[in-house]
Interface confidence: low
Amino acid sequence: MVPPPENVRMNSVNFKNILQWESPAFAKGNLTFTAQYLSYRIFQDKCMNTTLTECDFSSLSKYGDHTLRVRAEFADEHSDWVNITFCPVDDTIIGPPGMQVEVLADSLHMRFLAPKIENEYETWTMKNVYNSWTYNVQYWKNGTDEKFQITPQYDFEVLRNLEPWTTYCVQVRGFLPDRNKAGEWSEPVCEQTTHDETVPS
C-alpha cells in the first residue's frame, strides 16, 4: 500500500499558486507524484509522475473554487488522492508592495507599486484584480515604538513637516476594505530628513 502525500497545502502569493506537499516515508523506493485539478467535472493532469513535492497551479482562473488533488505513486501502485479546495481571489496572500522614498528637506515623498502578478501582462498588478485596493502606510521615528498609520488616497504620499535631521522609517501594505483583508508589510525603509525649509524671519 502506497501512503498518501502529507501536509498538502497551497502556497499562494500574488496568485502564484504552488501546491506543496511532503513525501511520506516509504521503504520500497522513491515515490513519484501526480497532481490534478478539476475542470468541467473532469480531473486534468497538471504535474505527472514528478519527483518534486510541489506543482505550479498559477494558470488557474483567479475566481471560483478549484478542487486540486495529489497522490503518491510507486511502480503500478498508488495512494489515495488527497484533495484540497482553493479559491485564489479569496485565499492568495497579498505580498508587500514596492516603495520608493525620497527625502526633500523636512518631508518624505513616497511612491507605491502594487505587487506584480507574475503570470500576467508585464503591467498587471494586484490592483487590477481588486477594485477596492488601497494602501496602508505606517511610519515612525527610528528608535521609537510609537507608530502612525495613514491611508493614502493615491499611489503616492508625502509626509510633511517632519523633524529635521531625524531618521524616519516607513513601510506599506496593500489593504482591501471591502474584504477587510490586509497584505504583508514591506520591509521598512529608513531615511533621514535634512533641514527645515521654513525661512527664518
Epitope: N11, V13, N14, K16, I18, L52, E54, C55, D56, S58, G95, P96, P97, G98, M99, Q100, V101, L113, P115, K116, E118, E122, T125, E184, W185, S186, E187, V189
Partner: nanobody, 126 residues
Framework: QVQLQESGGGLVQPGGSLRLSCAAS????????MSWVRQAPGKGLEWVSQ????????SYADSVKGRFTISRDNAKNTLYLQMNSLKPEDTAVYYC???????????????????WGQGTQVTVSS
C-alpha cells in the same frame, strides 16, 4: 532534495570577466524567480540581481548595472551571472537564491528566499 550549486568563481584581475552558474535540482526551477545575492568580507548580504520565472524581466543593483547580466535556461535548470568590468569592490561570496515570491524589482520591498546555494567566492585583485 533541493540543491542550488554555484560554480564559476575564482580570482580575476580588475577589468576582467567571470561567468557564474547556478545549477538547480529538486524543485520546480521554472516556477521560481531567481536572484544573485553577495556578501563581501565583513559585510552583510547585498542583493545583486534578479530574474523572473520566464526570464523576460530582469533588474540589477545600481552598483552592478551595465556590468552584470543575469540570465536563465529553464531547460537546463540553470541560472547565470555574466560579470564584466570587475572591480575590487565586487569581491564577495556570491549566492544564488530561489524565491516563490518575486516582487517588482528596482523598488524597495521584501525579498524572501525559499532556497539558497552554498556560494562561490569571487576575488577581484591585481
Amino acid at each position: 532534495q533541493v540543491q542550488l550549486q554555484e560554480s564559476g568563481g575564482g580570482l580575476v584581475q580588475p577589468g576582467g570577466s567571470l561567468r557564474l552558474s547556478c545549477a538547480a535540482s529538486g524543485f520546480a526551477f521554472s516556477s521560481y524567480g531567481m536572484s544573485w545575492v553577495r556578501q563581501a568580507p565583513g559585510k552583510g548580504l547585498e542583493w545583486v540581481s534578479q530574474i523572473n520565472t520566464g526570464g523576460g524581466s530582469t533588474s540589477y543593483a545600481d552598483s552592478v548595472k551595465g556590468r552584470f547580466t543575469i540570465s536563465r535556461d529553464n531547460a537546463k535548470n540553470t541560472l547565470y551571472l555574466q560579470m564584466n568590468s570587475l572591480k575590487p569592490e565586487d569581491t564577495a561570496v556570491y549566492y544564488c537564491a530561489a524565491s516563490s515570491r518575486l516582487y517588482s524589482s528596482s523598488w524597495y520591498g521584501s525579498r524572501e528566499y525559499d532556497y539558497w546555494g552554498q556560494g562561490t567566492q569571487v576575488t577581484v585583485s591585481s
